[in-house]
């Protein structure tokens, strides 16, 4: 095959090699860019910057090599459009630094930076950490800082991500209140900070105020939906990013729902309870307190992380006719109480007969109003009561 005369030539089914001296000063308009998985660039001394727009349209790119070229600067968001990138070789360029943001969000198996005049500073603390943790093949490169010695020996005591403290109201918050949160940011070289409020939706009206180093957030007219929702303050410097999440507890009264008993392995009377603080629960059976046991007990489902409502079952492992009756769930917290009742019939009473049946005896009733909550049978105290055991 005749040699390829272009600046960039196909290599394999989805690769491109650009090795002709000085032919490129940017990566715009590469042929077949959208299908490329491998891009090899060498000897491009005019290629000095790598920015977001350079790699737009290279969504399938997995291997990127830019070596022995003039690369001085890689933008923090340069690889935003190449999320599949797993091998990045930028060796023998003119890079003095590389932001932690550049590689954030990528799953790099290999990162090669040898042969660059790196400048040791806190901005390379992340790379030093990669070296310490054996990531991306970095330790094998024995990276040096220009005129400063090995990267591994760079002092890092002062290289910390920002420190965040979020102040939340310690008094009880009620539905309809306004809540002021403040995020204090400390640290060197602060670059950006803000709030992440994606979980809040309709939980409150949001107003942001202030800037570094003290960010304010007012949550106006809060609803009970705000409970269990994360309000997150974040800040970044050249070392990395810090986030702190808090939750605001909005008090509201207990509520309860009961549903028809269902057979699930044994039996379950499903319920839902809500309230902040979490309500205490009590069951009644036919108006008397039901003492829970290993065969009749409350079992909660795994709670959803972002809501206060709890779902569960009153488990009845072996209910018979003596367990038929009215079940009431009482829920209470300091802001109110609620109850719900449901009739449950698990099994016909084998001692009950159709009154038209010609059987000349009366049958002793079952007292389901046991205060202990344990199934109890009492014999009828009338003189003509006859007990019949049905086997």
């Amino acid at each position: 095959a005749a040699p390829c005369p272009d600046a960039c030539c196909p290599h394999g089914s989805s690769g491109l090699r650009c090795t002709r001296d000085g032919a490129l000063d940017s990566l715009h308009h590469l042929p077949g860019a959208e299908n490329l998985t491998e891009l090899y660039i060498e000897n491009q001394q005019h290629l000095q910057h790598l920015e977001l727009r350079d790699l737009r349209g290279l969504g399938e790119l997995r291997n990127l090599t830019i070596v022995k070229s003039g690369l001085r600067f890689v933008a923090p968001d340069a690889f935003h459009f190449t999320p599949r990138l797993s091998r990045l070789n930028l060796s023998f360029n003119a890079l003095e630094s590389l932001s932690w943001k550049t590689v954030q969000g990528l799953s790099l198996q290999e990162l090669v930076l040898s042969g660059n005049p790196l400048h040791c500073s806190c901005a390379l603390r992340w790379l030093q950490r990669w070296e310490e943790e054996g990531l991306g093949g970095v330790p094998e490169q024995k990276l040096q800082c220009h005129g400063q010695g090995p990267l591994a020996h760079m002092p890092n005591a002062s290289c910390g991500v920002p420190t965040l403290k979020v102040q939340v109201p310690n008094a009880s918050v009620d539905v309809g209140d306004d809540v002021l949160l403040r995020c204090q940011v400390e640290g060197r070289g602060l670059e950006q900070a803000g709030w992440i409020l994606t979980e809040l939706e309709q939980s409150a009206t949001v107003m942001k105020s202030g800037g570094l180093p003290s960010l304010g957030l007012t949550l106006a007219n809060v609803t009970s939906d705000l409970n269990r929702k994360n309000v997150t303050c974040w800040a970044e410097n050249d070392v990395g990013r810090a986030e702190v999440s808090v939750q605001v507890n909005v008090s509201f009264p207990a509520s309860v729902q009961l549903h028809t008993a269902v057979e699930m392995h044994h039996w379950c009377i499903p319920f839902s309870v809500d309230g902040q603080p979490a309500p205490s629960l009590r069951w009644l059976f036919n108006g008397s307190v039901l003492n829970e046991t290993s065969f009749i007990f409350t079992e909660f489902l795994e709670p959803a992380a972002n809501e206060t409502v709890r779902h569960g079952c009153l488990r009845l492992n072996q209910p018979t006719h003596v367990n038929n009756g009215n079940y009431t769930l009482l829920a209470a917290n300091p802001f109110g109480q609620a109850s719900a009742s449901i009739m449950a019939a698990f099994m016909d009473n084998p001692f009950e007969f159709n009154p038209e049946d010609p059987i000349p005896v009366s049958f002793s009733p079952v007292d389901t109003n046991s205060t202990s909550g344990d199934p109890v049978e009492k014999k009828d105290e009338t003189p003509f009561g006859v007990s019949v055991a049905v086997g």
Epitope: H265, H266, N291, E292, T293, S294, F295, F297, T298, E299, F300, R315, N317, Q318, P319, T320, V322, M347, S372, D374, P375, V376, E377, A389
Partner: antibody, heavy 117, light 106 residues
Framework: QVQLVQSGAEVKKPGASVKVSCKSS????????MHWVRQAPGQGLEWMGE????????NYNEKFKNRVTMTVDISISTAYMELSRLRSDDTAVYYC??????????WGQGTTVTVSS | DVQLTQSPSSLSASVGDRVTITCSAS?????MHWYQQKPGKAPKRLIY???KLASGVPSRFSGSGSGTDYTLTISSLQPEDFATYFC?????????FGQGTRLEIK
């Protein structure tokens, strides 16, 4: 697999207390009730009580109510049964057993407690 | 308390025999459960909810009954079946066991 491993044999004097442990593994400790059952030499099985780690709920057999205390340490998935004011007729093998929807599915290997002066 | 009375208290039988153990409750219980215990070992669940076989239990074991009268049947005794059998109720506190039936080789 599910395992209930009990503490070793104990010899106690009358009037003393004994605390038997039952370490669980192979299942979610908080989802199951733990029962304690004892068996005197050559005798039948006697239920002492039950505890639900999830809510700390306890039910005791009236016979032992003033002498027995059942507790759990959720962090190490372990249940405990303490019996106080021991008498010679408390000499028995003490078992733990777990239940959720069915009774006493799995049992510990037993702990022999001997009460002797 | 619900008293459970097993009969017989002891029983001699031969390999291949059909054996029935009964358990009578002092008041109606919803279900009965059966355990097998061998000397020096913890009890092992045999039958639960009156008639359900626990995992790994051979089908020669069966249970039946309702109300106050329950039965454990072994259709054809095997050498490993010689042990003590207990019934248990799980319907009211305190949970109670029968006094046991010792099954011996004739």
């Amino acid at each position: 697999q599910v395992q209930l491993v009990q503490s070793g044999a104990e010899v106690k004097k009358p009037g003393a207390s004994v605390k038997v442990s039952c370490k669980s593994s192979g299942y979610t400790f908080t989802n199951y009730w733990m029962h304690w059952v004892r068996q005197a030499p050559g005798q039948g099985l006697e239920w002492m009580g039950e505890i639900y780690p999830n809510q700390g709920r306890v039910n005791y057999n009236e016979k032992f109510k003033n002498r027995v205390t059942m507790t759990v340490d959720i962090s190490i998935s372990t249940a405990y049964m303490e019996l106080s004011r021991l008498r010679s007729d408390d000499t028995a093998v003490y078992y733990c057993a777990r239940s959720r929807y069915d009774p006493m599915e799995d049992w510990g290997q037993g702990t022999t407690v001997t009460v002797s002066s | 308390d619900v008293q459970l009375t097993q009969s017989p208290s002891s029983l001699s039988a031969s390999v291949g025999d059909r054996v029935t153990i009964t358990c009578s409750a002092s008041s109606s219980v919803g279900y009965m459960h059966w355990y097998q215990q061998k000397p020096g070992k913890a009890p092992k669940r045999l039958i639960y909810d009156t008639s359900k076989l626990a995992s790994g239990v051979p089908s020669r074991f069966s249970g039946s009954g309702s109300g106050t009268d329950y039965t454990l049947t072994i259709s054809s005794l095997q050498p490993e079946d010689f042990a003590t059998y207990f019934c248990q109720q799980w319907s009211s506190i305190p949970l109670t066991f029968g006094q046991g039936t010792r099954l011996e080789i004739k």
